[in-house]
């Protein structure tokens, strides 16, 4: 039991896409605030989002130091006025998330079809590797720095004139199809990591076809 | 843990038409690509086709893409394969199978389909 | 599309024989190469996947080298349980396509 007026946080939630990591909560605070925790299994609590009338709190900074480890947060609820008042076992009102693993859980973004471009029979379909958050030596990693091998593109494409479709798989950032000459083609890629368990799939790229800005011919 | 359990398989008379269901139990089916495959007594494997169960895509060997439609039910987790203008040589054991993109790490028991008249 | 040729169509062999069986694609797979067990009246096992990694609960007499367009599977030491037929596999695009099967006889 905590305080008078004062609810614990319920429905923790990890919201991750490319390792950009909001934890989320309800309820909307009437008369009080939060301050959020987080920690690694092994570490110490650090806070974030001090006293805070939100119900999310943004801990991309924190989950990046280390992708692989799997972290853990707490959410406290203080009264609005009262900040240094406890609950009846003289602690703040707090509840635990669920654990997250960044590097097993955070969904694959929608990827981005780079450029094509055709050359004779074979058309080249790269597709754009995403900056990440989670850094190292002080520069952003991409999404292939980090997931590596883990990570492979599908490429469904078409010709224009058909619903057929054919598929390709790549564990780099391209793809080098047969294409028939003469005719246009569209293309969407999804990225997926084959390890997963969970959220192992993005949502498909915008389709985009030959014939437009994107492409180039050469013969 | 992970299942597949084809139904549907039987006689069919040539011209004719199967349905065949592929009922997923102990994962999402959303989460993979699901394929078909069939085997003719005595001989090898043959791919049919493949559904991305959440994005709606599907891929099909060139020689099924007139006669062969793959679809799935997210809510009923189930894959299913339709094949149109069925011939004797369709006669064969139809699997379903769990594909991770890297390799298919499950396979359905099978289920015998028998064109004739 | 892809055709994938496997050889031997069949071989005999005796318990703790080392095993070879070959793969050759008409091009490039880039290691997208799986190889299956497949036993009499049973659905296909994965053996091996991307052409060199063994999967889980596999014993580790199987193995699979190769790149580009030639492949192997080799079993160190066949056990009773291994006489089946094997296939490759490239799912690298598709439409997927297998080898011819090789079926691995008591001799």
């Known amino acids: 039991s905590g305080t008078t007026n004062t609810v614990a946080a319920y429905n923790l939630t990890w919201k991750s896409t490319n390792f950009k990591t909001i934890l989320e909560w309800e309820p909307k605070p009437v008369n009080q605030v939060y301050t959020v925790q987080i920690s690694t299994k092994s570490g110490d609590w650090k806070s974030k989002c001090f006293y805070t009338t939100d119900t999310e709190c943004d801990l991309t900074d924190e989950i990046v130091k280390d992708v692989k480890q799997t972290y853990l947060a707490r959410v406290f609820s203080y009264p609005a006025g009262n900040v240094e008042s406890t609950g009846s076992a003289g602690e703040p009102l707090y509840e635990n998330s669920p654990e997250f693993t960044p590097y097993l859980e955070t969904n694959l973004g929608q990827p981005t079809i780079q450029s094509f471009e055709q050359v004779g029979t074979k058309v080249n379909v790269t597709v754009e590797d995403e900056r990440t958050l989670v850094r190292r030596n002080n520069t952003f990693l991409s999404l292939r720095d980090v997931f590596g091998k883990d990570l492979i593109y599908t490429l469904y494409y078409w010709k224009s004139s058909s619903s057929g479709k054919k598929t390709a798989k790549t564990n780099t950032n391209e793809f080098l199809i047969d294409v028939d000459k003469g005719e246009n083609y569209c293309f969407s890629v999804q990225a997926v990591i084959p390890s997963r368990t969970v959220n192992r799939k993005s949502t498909d790229s915008p389709v985009e076809c030959m014939g437009q800005e994107k492409g180039e011919f050469r013969e | 843990e992970v299942q597949l359990v084809e139904s549907g398989g039987g006689l069919v008379q040539p011209g004719g038409s199967l349905r065949l269901s592929c009922a997923a139990s102990?994962?999402?089916?959303?989460?993979?690509?699901m394929h078909w495959w069939r085997q003719a007594p005595g001989k090898g494997l043959e791919w049919v086709g493949l559904?991305?169960?959440?994005?709606?895509?599907?891929i099909y060997d060139p020689k099924f893409q007139d006669r062969a439609t793959i679809s799935a039910d997210n809510s009923k987790n189930t894959a299913y394969l339709q094949m149109n203008s069925l011939r004797a040589e369709d006669t064969a054991v139809y699997y379903c199978?769990?594909?991770?993109?890297?390799?298919?790490?499950?396979f359905g028991q099978g289920t015998l389909v028998t064109v004739s008249s | 599309d892809i055709q994938m040729t496997q050889s031997p169509s069949s071989l005999s062999a005796s318990v703790g024989d080392r095993v070879t069986i070959t793969c050759r694609a008409s091009?490039?797979?880039?290691?997208?190469l799986n190889w299956y067990q497949q036993k009499p009246g049973k659905a296909p096992k994965v053996l091996i996947y991307?052409?060199?990694s063994l999967a889980e609960g596999v014993p580790s007499r199987f193995s699979g080298s190769g790149s580009g367009t030639d492949y192997t599977l080799t079993i160190s030491s066949l056990q009773p349980e291994d006489f089946a037929t094997y296939y490759c596999?490239?799912?690298?695009?598709?439409?997927?396509?297998l080898g011819q099967g090789t079926k691995v006889e008591i001799k």
């Open positions: 102990g994962f999402n089916i959303k989460e993979y690509y």
């Open positions: 991307y052409a060199t």
């Open positions: 091009r490039d797979i880039k290691s997208y």
């Open positions: 559904i991305d169960p959440e994005q709606g895509n599907t």
């Open positions: 596999l490239q799912h690298g695009e598709s439409p997927w396509t």
């Open positions: 199978a769990r594909d991770t993109a890297a390799y298919f790490d499950y």
